[in-house]
């Protein structure tokens, strides 16, 4: 059994989250995860879910009685979601910590917007699209 | 030229984000995106970046002078990042709107934690890992 299971049960007690009525009015995350099978779609959703848990854990970092549980779960998330890659985890944390109300951050975000947008489509990053367009044009020109 | 480019230039003026000094102290997003080539890693990062922009745009939704620009950019993000899939965009928005300080939300999140964790590894959802382990065991047993 993964170490997180026991610690998650401890958190359930702490948050009073074991009762059946907690499941009333549908799920938060599980229903959404069920909708997406494609790995890249799942990563889009899981990214938001993991950042939610990180925020929640951060808010309760001073509660001694769950500190060990929180640390164990975070470590296990690190293994499972970030593949134990510290750089990946650090970059992710950086992104989640930017303040959306800080004018300097806002300016930088707007400054980078065009380039960010250009990279959003899966094809964009490799230059595949450009290459195939050029091949297509070249073919037409030589006909 | 994509429609977002002109509108992003308009936002640059509005936020005074065209000056070279905006780029001081490194980038917010571009440097991080450069680190990740693998599509699923990029989606993890882009998910946070897109939610940052959505939050930023939401904060400025009452500023008439940039409303058209914001709407155009959001629509283009929808096309590029969510592949014009309304369900995907809606699920994403749902996740970004959960309040991390609401006890009922906290309870649900903790209630779902074990199942969420079980799905975090790429192999988890398809049962690939189990299948390959069984094949490996079978092979060893038949040698």
């Amino acid at each position: 059994q993964d170490p997180y299971v026991k610690e998650a049960e401890n958190l359930k007690k702490y948050f009073n989250a074991g009762h059946s009525d907690v499941a009333d009015n549908g799920t938060l995350f599980l229903g959404i995860l069920k909708n997406w099978k494609e790995e890249s779609d799942r990563k889009i959703m899981q990214s938001q879910i993991v950042s939610f848990y990180f925020k929640l854990f951060k808010n309760f970092k001073d509660d001694q009685s769950i500190q060990k549980s929180v640390e164990t779960i975070k470590e296990d998330m690190n293994v499972k979601f970030f593949n134990s890659n510290k750089k990946k985890r650090d970059d992710f944390e950086k992104l989640t910590n930017y303040s959306v109300t800080d004018l300097n951050v806002q300016r930088k975000a707007i400054h980078e917007l065009i380039q960010v947008m250009a990279e959003l489509s899966p094809a964009a990053k490799t230059g595949k699209r450009k290459r195939s367009q050029m091949l297509f044009r070249g073919r037409r020109a030589s006909q | 030229q994509d429609p977002y480019v002109k509108e992003a230039e308009n936002l640059k003026k509005y936020f005074n984000a065209g000056h070279s000094d905006v780029a001081d102290n490194g980038t917010l997003f571009l440097g991080i995106l450069k680190n990740w080539k693998e599509e699923s890693d990029r989606k993890i990062m882009q998910s946070q970046i897109v939610s940052f922009y959505f939050k930023l745009f939401k904060n400025f939704k009452d500023d008439q002078s940039i409303q058209k620009s914001v709407e155009t950019i959001k629509e283009d993000m929808n096309v590029k990042f969510f592949n014009s899939n309304k369900k995907k965009r809606d699920d994403f928005e749902k996740l970004t709107n959960y309040s991390v300080t609401d006890l009922n939300v906290q309870r649900k999140a903790i209630h779902e934690l074990i199942q969420v964790m079980a799905e975090l590894s790429p192999a988890a959802k398809t049962g690939k890992r189990k299948r390959s382990q069984m094949l490996f065991r079978g092979r060893r047993a038949s040698q």
Epitope: K13, Y14, F15, N16, N59, F60, D62, D63, S65 | T101, D102, L103, Q106
Partner: nanobody, 126 residues
């Protein structure tokens, strides 16, 4: 030891607003979760709203969701309850209470809380 004193009650019309305040004295107010309860004549104490340390967890009774807002100021050692769109059924004595452990606080049972005040009367006429 924490002493709690509620204020801000009164007689108002349906649809009006009121802001209740609870002043704490004693040590380490910031380490307590706070809750507002109410008791209508002849009824049990009913949980209204709760706020955990530094506001990292909040919850409301379904009957007041969207109308009442709880907040705290640890520097001033106060917890407030902003009550909007009041209804006659909100009429009760309102008590503020303090609890030191999260699992007990989040169950929202008046008898389980460590400390409570004397209450302030809120009357909403139609």
């Amino acid at each position: 030891q924490v002493q709690l004193q509620e204020s801000g009650g009164g007689l108002v019309q349906a649809g009006d607003s009121l802001r209740l305040s609870c002043a704490a004295s004693g040590r380490s107010f910031s380490s307590y979760g706070m809750g507002w309860f109410r008791q209508a004549p002849g009824k049990e104490h009913e949980f209204v709203a709760g706020i955990w340390r530094s506001g990292v967890s909040l919850y409301y009774a379904d009957s007041v969701k969207g109308r009442f807002t709880i907040s705290r100021d640890d520097a001033k050692m106060t917890v407030s309850l902003q009550m909007n769109s009041l209804k006659p059924e909100d009429t009760a004595v309102y008590y503020c209470a303090a609890e030191a452990t999260f699992p007990t606080w989040n169950r929202g049972r008046f008898a389980d809380y460590d400390y409570s005040g004397q209450g302030t009367q809120v009357t909403v006429s139609s």
